[in-house]
């Protein structure tokens, strides 16, 4: 596709080189069951995603591979994610001390950008919430969405504070997407 | 800025067939007081909406009718909704047992797609939250938004777990929208 | 506006005048430490923002000045904001009575439009939540986003119920943006 810098002729009126909206990079990814993976103590684990079944899709050179969305073209993208968390609150402090409770102090989602030429990931969006549910079963979503200028080759991922609390049961509850504006 | 009505020349450079952004189907609907309706036990009721007063609008063949947004053209749409819920927590278990309490166990919003050729709706987005408020008055929003490939003739609606808990008092608190990307 | 079916001149293919997507007004603003300001009792204070460092940017005549985003061109805009609130819950009612507690009854974000020719601001979006956290430290985000028809010269701001509760520590936690569709 023409990139938008090559404009045209000598007369007054100026026209856009072809950039049909339908050919812009776009993706909507949906949750899958997560396989527990080793991760560093202070680093949140990344989720992996369904990219072609059900409501999920990638198109126009936006590819998904190994937990990352690959940005195929520089530009301004709207990026969004929702993660639904759920767990069980054990009321007894004895139970709570024995092993890791399923009632955390907080839940966090981070949308992160990785650039190969730069060692440190950039946190684009963070949603973080203290958890003070008192019932035995609790669940709640965290939604994020915003616009960022990305470069060709950038990679996007979604990290969470505790992968075991992510609700992977339905594609409409936990998802991740991006589209070129 | 050029407004999209002035068209163009005969030379080589390639141009996009007319799709001025301003002519894309778009809608932003706002809350109205809901009339309680009969609905099946395991089916969440659909909200109805204001589509032309105040901040609400529909344009470019995106029409609203009978709780549904009608998709006039196939393509990728960004769809969003916020529903603000509110209720009163009755602390007394006697009061709680007498009649339905206004403090539910959970609140849920679902954005649903209906295709005429198929009886079963498809859930596109769901925001669901356990409610463990302890104060007497509680209120909170659930926000959803994502991109989906829709077909001409698809219909979108917003369903909620309990219509009586929806805050219909202000157009900025509870809303529903979609636009072709 | 042309409705999409009625195209134009005598030759077959019709072309759009230049509106490269890259030249549309866009902004993503990020949180900065707020300077407490005088505000009227029933009016929520406006946040001010970073507009050019880190992830923040304004482009294509979308300007930020004095807490406002200035709309340079009429059209339909997607507007969004997230505000992360945090505070300390003092359990003791004595402490709570002495001075203002850092545990409010509710937290609210409003995205507001100001039109010079109209004296009264218009609330476009509101996210409001009762706070019933029981732990000593609490934090949570409120996210908003929707599409509105704006006029050249309109100004947008974000108001909050209590500026002292806004988490200004990270640009990914509290932000505000808009882009022309």
């Amino acid at each position: 596709a023409l990139k938008g810098q090559e404009f045209a002729p000598s007369h007054q009126q100026v026209y856009a080189p072809l950039r049909a909206d339908g050919d812009k990079p776009r993706a909507h990814l949906t949750v899958v069951r997560q396989t527990p993976t080793q991760h560093f103590k202070n680093q949140f684990p990344a989720l992996h995603w369904e990219h072609e079944l059900g409501l999920a899709f990638t198109k126009n050179r936006m590819n998904y591979t190994n937990k990352f969305l690959l940005i195929p073209e520089s530009g301004d993208y709207f990026i969004y994610s929702q993660v639904t968390f759920r767990g069980m609150t054990s009321e007894s402090s004895e139970i709570r001390q024995a092993g890791r409770p399923n009632k955390p102090d907080s839940i966090t989602v981070v949308i992160t950008k990785v650039t190969d030429s730069y060692p440190e990931p950039t946190q684009l969006l963070m949603g973080t919430k203290s958890v003070s549910e008192v019932g035995s079963n609790w669940f709640q979503p965290i939604y994020l969405g915003a616009m960022f200028s990305l470069q060709e080759g950038d990679k996007l991922m979604v990290n969470v504070s505790d992968i075991s609390l992510v609700d992977y049961t339905k594609e409409d509850k936990t998802f991740f997407g991006a589209f070129l504006l | 800025a050029l407004k999209g009505q002035e068209f163009a020349p005969s030379h080589q450079q390639v141009y996009a067939p007319l799709r001025a952004d301003g002519d894309k189907p778009r809608a932003h609907l706002t809350v109205v007081r809901q009339t309680p309706t009969q609905h099946f036990k395991n089916q969440f009721p659909a909200l109805h909406w204001e589509h032309e007063l105040g901040l609400a609008f529909t344009k470019n063949r995106m029409n609203y009718t009978n709780k549904f947004l009608l998709i006039p053209e196939s393509g990728d749409y960004f769809i969003y909704s916020q529903v603000t819920f509110r209720g009163m927590t009755s602390e007394s278990s006697e009061i709680r047992q007498a009649g339905r309490p206004n403090k539910p166990d959970s609140i849920t919003v679902v954005i649903t797609k209906v295709t005429d050729s198929y009886p079963e709706p498809t859930q596109l987005l769901m925001g669901t939250k356990s409610v463990s408020e302890v104060g007497s008055n509680w209120f909170q929003p659930i926000y959803l938004g994502a991109m989906f490939s829709l077909q001409e003739g698809d219909k979108l609606m917003v369903n909620v777990s309990d219509i009586s808990l929806v805050d219909y008092t202000k157009e900025d608190k509870t809303f529903f929208g979609a636009f072709l990307l | 506006a042309l409705k999409g079916q009625e195209f134009a001149p005598s030759h077959q293919q019709v072309y759009a005048p230049l509106r490269a997507d890259g030249d549309k007004p866009r902004a993503h603003l990020t949180v900065v430490r707020q300077t407490p300001t005088q505000h009227f009792k029933n009016q929520f204070p406006a946040l001010h923002w970073e507009h050019e460092l880190g992830l923040a940017f304004t482009k294509n005549r979308m300007n930020y000045t004095n807490k406002f985003l200035l709309i340079p061109e009429s059209g339909d805009y997607f507007i969004y904001s997230q505000v992360t609130f945090r505070g300390m819950t003092s359990e003791s009612s004595e402490i709570r009575q002495a001075g203002r507690p850092n545990k409010p009854d509710s937290i609210t974000v409003v995205i507001t439009k100001v039109t010079d020719s109209y004296p009264e601001p218009t609330q476009l979006l509101m996210g409001t939540k009762s706070v019933s956290e029981v732990g000593s430290n609490w934090f949570q985000p409120i996210y908003l986003g929707a599409m509105f028809s704006l006029q050249e010269g309109d100004k947008l701001m974000v108001n909050v119920s209590d500026i002292s509760l806004v988490d200004y520590t990270k640009e990914d936690k509290t932000f505000f943006g808009a882009f022309l569709l």
Partner: antibody, heavy 124, light 107 residues
């Protein structure tokens, strides 16, 4: 009810192409992918490829790459499979099948609805 | 691509007997394995999805188990209509692949 109806039997000469259609009814066509499976006389099932009815993405069996093209027409709720440069060993019954998906990250499902099959005979 | 090997190739049993069919994958397919039944002149029918979940309308005598590389389809008590060819299919990695089939015939 949910069904897939395929086009009729075809007889083709080696080197020719064949295009088999598969019309869906009774369900949301764009939600479920379509796989194509073939079965040569007296042989087992061979998966040929898959197409997303949602956005047209495809995956093909390696052996058929370059010779097979799968497409869909959402307006008529029809999937198509075209096989080019036919050889005698392409003689088979060709099935389309709906790839069920339960909308859950816990499951991958299976091919739960099948067409009646289309016999393609390649003979000089 | 992932190769699925079914055994035995043929199983000769009488009605009322228990049938145990095996499917082994050349690499892990997690639980993403389906079983199909095919009778002569008919299209295949989905029996089991995701290793152990019975498809709609499938009788309880059919059950599936296993994960990773080793899977089993069990028919607890063979009915006359169960004599057919059974195929496993992996749905973990593209390209999807089928096993070569196990024929369950009347002894």
């Amino acid at each position: 009810q949910v069904q897939l109806v395929q086009s009729g039997a075809e007889v083709k000469k080696p080197g020719a192409s064949v295009k088999v259609s598969c019309k869906a009814s009774g369900y949301d066509f764009t939600y479920y992918g379509i796989s194509w499976v073939r079965q040569a006389p007296g042989q087992g099932l061979e998966w040929m490829g898959w197409i997303s009815t949602y956005n047209g993405n495809t995956h093909y069996a390696r052996m058929l790459q370059g010779r097979v093209t799968m497409t869909t027409d959402t307006s008529t709720r029809t999937a198509y499979m075209e096989l080019r440069s036919l050889r005698s060993d392409d003689t088979a019954v060709y099935y389309c099948a709906r790839e069920t998906y339960y909308g859950s990250g816990a499951y991958r499902g299976g091919m739960d609805v099948w067409g009646q099959g289309t016999t393609v005979t390649v003979s000089s | 691509e992932i190769v699925l090997t079914q055994s035995p190739a043929t199983l000769s049993l009488s009605p009322g007997e228990r049938a145990t069919l095996s499917c082994r994958a050349s690499q892990s397919v997690s639980s993403y394995l389906a079983w199909y039944q095919q009778k002569p002149g008919q299209a295949p029918r989905l029996l089991i999805y995701d290793a152990s979940n019975r498809a709609t309308g499938i009788p309880a005598r059919f059950s599936g188990s296993g994960s990773g590389t080793d899977f089993t389809l069990t028919i607890s008590s063979l009915e006359p209509e169960d004599f057919a060819v059974y195929y496993c299919q992996q749905r973990s990695n593209w390209p999807w692949t089928f096993g070569q089939g196990t024929k369950v015939e009347i002894k």
